[in-house]
Amino acid sequence: NKILVKQSPMLVAYDNAVNLSCKYSYNLFSREFRASLHKGLDSAVEVCVVYGNYSQQLQVYSKTGFNCDGKLGNESVTFYLQNLYVNQTDIYFCKIEVMYPPPYLDNEKSNGTIIHVKGKHLCPSPLFPGPSKP
């Protein structure tokens, strides 16, 4: 028995930040779980982890240097990534694992979300136009 995960097909990070919502076919209320976000087609980089259990505050961390936060809904976890770089444009996959109560459950691999990180373009101000061409 596998949990199904829904993600937006694509998100654009205009200000080097993005909210990626992972929606599950499973209610996480009063469960011990590990929700994680993975980068790349092979999910090689674990970007962020949200750990939750019935008796403790939500714990969010990244072992790979990403600036991330997480919010919990009954059937969702939203990852908030900040300070993204243009070269971190990639496909990102949500993963959910329920550790307690038994049995252990995880998800069918989702289709993923392409996060397109747009660089900050500094447009010339109309008050100070660039040098005019001859």
Epitope: Q59, K63, M99, Y100, D106
Partner: antibody, heavy 120, light 107 residues
């Protein structure tokens, strides 16, 4: 209280195999990895590998990948480490320890250690 | 694999001394560094996790600092029960690796 209790000392001949057990109690077995770490006489600590009892996924140190086998029996909250084709330099104390599956970075509880002596 | 190196490999100190042990990682491990104490014939005991967090029940004379590649364990005032071997361990990426250890002996 939280405990990891290991099986007793073993003496083996070169080429043989050894299987060490680690019985967990006092916590939810499927919330933690079980890791195996060894320490040769007078030497430092060497990580062998780990297993997660929830889905029995394993991670191995490349050095031990073809000789170590990690298993669990969740019905009795026990983990096992089998090391095959033993050599004299496998003589060591073997420890089991745990790390949290959701917050996995340190080893907070250790077994008492199992001495394995390999000698002809 | 991430290599962990510790210095010194051994040191002699007296009760009441301030003792500092350093640990170096071969690549950036952010704060994913733990410290353990081991006495002869016993299993290691966790002292510090995530570079600077004191594990439950560990005396406050132990402290840890650092991030990235360089880390420090400090014992502010050495007690008789602190004579032991100290190990650092990186928990950033598998395979988890330990340093060679520092043996703290009585002067």
């Amino acid at each position: 209280q939280v405990q990891l209790v290991q099986s007793g000392a073993e003496v083996k001949k070169p080429g043989a195999s050894v299987k060490v057990s680690c019985k967990a109690s006092g916590y939810t077995f499927t919330s933690y990895y079980i890791h195996w770490v060894r320490q040769a006489p007078g030497q430092g600590l060497e990580w062998i590998g780990c297993i997660y009892p929830g889905n029995v996924n394993t991670n191995y140190n490349e050095k031990f990948k073809d000789r170590a086998t990690l298993t669990v029996d969740t019905s009795i909250s026990t983990a096992y480490m089998e090391l095959s084709r033993l050599r004299s330099d496998d003589t060591a104390v073997y420890f089991c320890t745990r790390s949290h599956y959701g917050l996995d970075w340190n080893f907070d509880v250790w077994g008492q250690g199992t001495t394995v002596t390999v000698s002809s | 694999d991430i290599q962990m190196t510790q210095s010194p490999s051994s040191l002699s100190a007296s009760v009441g001394d301030r003792v500092t042990i350093t640990c170096h990682a071969s690549q950036n491990i952010y704060v994913w560094l733990n410290w353990y104490q081991q006495k002869p014939g016993k299993a290691p005991k966790l002292l510090i996790y995530k570079a600077s967090n004191l594990h439950t029940g560990v005396p406050s004379r132990f402290s840890g600092s650092g991030s990235g590649t360089d880390f420090t364990l400090t014992i502010s005032s050495l007690q008789p029960e602190d004579f032991a071997t100290y190990y650092c361990q990186q928990g950033q990426t598998y395979p988890y690796t330990f340093c060679g250890g520092t043996k703290v002996e009585i002067k």
